[in-house]
């Protein structure tokens, strides 16, 4: 039925649009950039991104229309709604602070919450993290007693345990919580990299051609026989 289809008979897709046959007598147009509408008959007024502040743009009869997010207004959603013009948003003498698309309450001492509608109790909930214990020191003040390994006004900061580390023989200190570990080079092992690795045990074939492996602190050596030489008696 292709030759009698509207795509061929009436060529409905304008402005260089491509016609796609959906069924015997229905079609869909894929428009060129800059055009929109069922038959690509409208100039896409949204192409210039006229809608501001995250609003959604739609084209209707060569005109754009912006659907604003909450908190914005105007033809292009360019105007911020000042929620603070309407009194009563913030309770208990809270100060209203207008923000792009929203507002915030800055509460007086003793109150908290989005609308300053809740009483502030220093340790409820506890601001102390990492297992710290909150102690109320005044009507509006608190102190956090931190577990070992943490510091900060809310115990938020890990104490670096590496400054006084005892990693030996080129061991690298890796900080933990109230502890540290030593990352040892291959020749050393143990908590502080003080124990020698016996390479002769780890590598039975370290010495070639009948050479004898001799473990040493921080390494090993080969005692070669029958005229062989070199680090591993291979020369």
């Amino acid at each position: 039925y292709s030759t009698s289809h509207p795509c061929f008979v009436s060529r409905p897709c304008l402005n260089g649009g491509t016609c796609h046959m959906l069924s015997r007598d229905t079609y869909e147009c894929t428009c060129q950039v800059g055009f929109t509408g069922k038959e690509c008959q409208w100039t896409d007024a949204c192409l210039s991104h006229p809608c501001a502040n995250g609003s959604t743009c739609t084209t209707v009869a060569n005109q754009f229309s912006c659907k604003c997010l909450t908190g914005f207004t105007g033809q292009k959603c360019e105007t911020d709604v000042n929620e603070c013009d309407i009194p009563g948003h913030c309770q208990h003498g809270g100060t209203c602070l207008n923000l792009p698309g929203s507002y915030q309450c800055q509460c007086p001492q003793g109150f908290t919450g989005q609308y300053c509608d809740s009483l502030y109790v220093p340790c409820a909930p506890s601001p102390c993290v990492n297992g710290g214990t909150c102690r109320q020191t005044g009507d509006f003040t608190f102190e956090c007693n931190c577990l070992p390994g943490f510091e900060g006004s809310t115990c938020e900061r890990n104490i670096d345990d590496c400054p006084n580390h005892r990693c030996q023989n080129g061991g690298v200190c890796v900080d933990g919580v109230n502890t540290y570990n030593c990352r040892c080079p291959p020749q050393w092992t143990g908590q502080f990299c003080t124990e020698d690795v016996d390479e002769c045990l780890l590598q039975p074939n370290a010495c070639q051609n009948g050479g004898t492996c001799a473990n040493r602190n921080g390494g090993y050596g080969c005692v070669c026989v029958n005229g062989w030489s070199g680090d591993d008696c291979s020369e």
């Epitope: 601001p127 003040t141 510091e151 900060g152 938020e156 900061r157």
Partner: antibody, heavy 120, light 107 residues
Framework: EVKLVDYGGGLVQPGASLRLSCEVS????????MEWIRQAPGKGLEWIAA??????????VYSASVKDRFTISRDTYKSILYLQMSTLKPEDTAVYYC???????????WGQGTSVIVSS | DIQMTQSPASLSASLGETVTIQCQTS??????LAWYHQKPGKSPQLLIY???RLQDGVPSRFTGSGSGTQYSLKISSMQTEDEGVYFC?????????FGSGTKLEIK
């Protein structure tokens, strides 16, 4: 309103000393850790010193680049944070900011900065 | 010291566009990360603390995410006032360290 005002910067010669001040208001000074941060011309931010809060006996910590040359301190009665800088070097040239540590992994209030130029 | 690797160093975006800045740390900082915005001649302003929490007074188009050693800041629908330099900073342990900054310009 939380407010921090930095002052005391200026032009000094290498080897000289200078004391920066940061006057704070709008919060309980002794409850918060306070930090000094600097920014060399056209460069990034560098932390240099901290004064812990009263609960931690106002103990101090420094970056390796200023240790033994700079001293952080505070006057809790006047609500002023200080940074005493000695043996100044040309590489100490920067804008110095004091800031309040929120206790929630962020510096939530900053001074306007005071400029220190070390040049002969 | 914990090293901070921030990328990109600079980028330009059109108004309304979404922008993402990355920050990588040399060790796990357990979400102890903050993001700041600085305009020329001004002090930095805290945007995000604790990796994902929005600071009071900061527009909700700013979103922080990440954990472990990988963190990002997303600015959805770029506005004129968003131009400037963005810094990440770890507050997990002393010394506090900052990323080298990302300069954001309007295309």
């Amino acid at each position: 309103e939380v407010k921090l005002v930095d002052y005391g910067g200026g032009l000094v010669q290498p080897g000289a000393s200078l004391r920066l001040s940061c006057e704070v208001s709008g919060f309980t000074f002794s409850d918060f850790y306070m930090e000094w941060i600097r920014q060399a011309p056209g460069k990034g931010l560098e932390w240099i010193a901290a004064s812990r809060n009263k609960a931690n006996n106002f103990s101090i910590v420094y970056s390796a680049s200023v240790k033994d040359r700079f001293t952080i301190s505070r006057d809790t009665y006047k609500s002023i944070l200080y940074l005493q800088m000695s043996t100044l070097k040309p590489e100490d040239t920067a804008v110095y900011y004091c800031s309040r540590d929120s206790g929630r992994w962020g510096l939530d209030a900053w001074g306007q900065g005071t400029s220190v130029i070390v040049s002969s | 010291d914990i090293q901070m690797t921030q990328s990109p160093a600079s980028l330009s975006a059109s108004l309304g566009e979404t922008v993402t800045i990355q920050c990588q740390t040399s060790e796990d900082i357990y979400s102890g990360l903050a993001w700041y915005h600085q305009k020329p001649g001004k002090s930095p302003q805290l945007l995000i603390y604790g990796a994902s929490r929005l600071q009071d007074g900061v527009p909700s188009r700013f979103t922080g995410s990440g954990s472990g050693t990988q963190y990002s800041l997303k600015i959805s629908s770029m506005q004129t006032e968003d131009e400037g330099v963005y810094f990440c900073q770890q507050g997990f342990k002393y010394p506090l360290t900052f990323g080298s900054g990302t300069k954001l310009e309007i295309k």
